[in-house]
Amino acid sequence: APVRSLNCTLRDSQQKSLVMSGPYELKALHLQGQDMEQQVVFSMSFVQGEESNDKIPVALGLKEKNLYLSCVLKDDKPTLQLESVDPKNYPKKKMEKRFVFNKIEINNKLEFESAQFPNWYISTSQAENMPVFLGGTKGGQDITDFTMQFVSS
């Protein structure tokens, strides 16, 4: 069977939504009313990987686009990027590790840890309109906690 994928949106713990910023970047900003339609809808796939009650391996694609969040080394630093893939082959149950995030939920907080780079998380800045990035610190200035809203297909 193919991998099961469900549509969702994400907001950081400051209630900032995620929107496209150019063809290969996401940014986080506060949206209201009709502007909420700008927010990115992810297709979250439940992929193969180590799983527990609090930790579920997922891949985060952009709905109806052949773009996936992936984690790679750039200048020796773990970096978040939007990577284009062949839609004939993706999504799949056995995603390459760079595409896999551990969705971790503990005490009303949802984090997305890179499977490729443990202890590196999808992060947003406190400031408005800044890029979504891969951060190596939790509990500091940068935001690593999210809420998730599933949406109908």
């Epitope: 549509n7 969702c8 579920i56 939920e105 009303n108 907080k109 998730m148 109908s152």
Partner: antibody, heavy 119, light 107 residues
Framework: EVQLVESGGGVVQPGRSLRLSCSAS????????MSWVRQAPGKGLEWVAY????????YYPDTVKGRFTISRDNSKNTLFLQMDSLRPEDTAVYYC????????????WGQGTLVTVSS | GIQMTQSPSSLSASVGDRVTITCRAS??????LTWYQQTPGKAPKLLIY???TLADGVPSRFSGSCSGTDYTFTISSLQPEDIATYYC?????????FGQGTKLQIT
């Protein structure tokens, strides 16, 4: 023994609000996703709200989106459904159920509480 | 979303009969299907998940199978306590929807 006990149902006028509660026992509540499923009189089943085990994930179908809000208090083993702008078509027995988006099915159910929306 | 069409809507059978209920999905749901039993005045009860896995404590006379997008629920030998309405439900894509139900009566 798993027990889910709903409360808070009753008769309410269209446009008004109601808050349902579900008290859980017999399992570790904070480890389970939870949902509300409703059944209009003599009709079938409809899933109306979901919340993940920690409370960070939610889902509502289009029929109730923007009007219903699901929440939970894991310290009190209690699930809630805040229902605003109620309509006559919201009249139903509302069941609290264990399960949701990830597992996909509901393996434990409460006995239900009847909500009647009528002027 | 995916619609589940359940048939028949009602049926009568005798104790000891083999009873079959069918659910047809409007799209492929890859065995992400559940069956519930609801006895009169009670809450639904999980019987089968993943199309053919029996839930804990469910008698072995109940079973599930599939062929393509058609899913079948079978009671091999009907018992008086099986008087109920049976529902299928898919959980492949949101919204997860239920079939309309099949009311089973004993003749």
């Amino acid at each position: 023994e798993v027990q889910l006990v709903e409360s808070g149902g009753g008769v309410v006028q269209p446009g008004r609000s109601l808050r349902l509660s579900c008290s859980a026992s017999g399992f570790i509540f904070s480890r389970y996703d939870m949902s509300w499923v409703r059944q209009a009189p003599g009709k079938g089943l409809e899933w109306v709200a979901y919340i993940s085990h920690g409370g960070a994930g939610t889902y509502y179908p289009d029929t109730v989106k923007g009007r219903f809000t699901i929440s939970r208090d894991n310290s009190k083993n209690t699930l809630f459904l805040q229902m605003d702008s109620l309509r006559p078509e919201d009249t139903a027995v509302y069941y609290c159920a264990r399960g949701g988006v990830y597992k996909g099915y509901f393996d434990e159910w409460g006995q239900g509480t009847l909500v009647t929306v009528s002027s | 979303g995916i619609q589940m069409t359940q048939s028949p809507s009602s049926l009568s059978a005798s104790v000891g009969d083999r009873v079959t209920i069918t659910c047809r999905a409007s799209g492929n749901i890859y065995d992400y299907l559940t069956w519930y039993q609801q006895t009169p005045g009670k809450a639904p009860k999980l019987l089968i998940y993943n199309a053919k896995t029996l839930a804990d404590g469910v008698p072995s006379r109940f079973s599930g199978s599939c062929s393509g997008t058609d899913y079948t629920f079978t009671i091999s030998s009907l018992q008086p306590e099986d008087i109920a309405t049976y529902y299928c439900q898919h959980f492949w894509s949101l919204p997860y929807t239920f079939g309309q139900g099949t009311k089973l009566q004993i003749t």
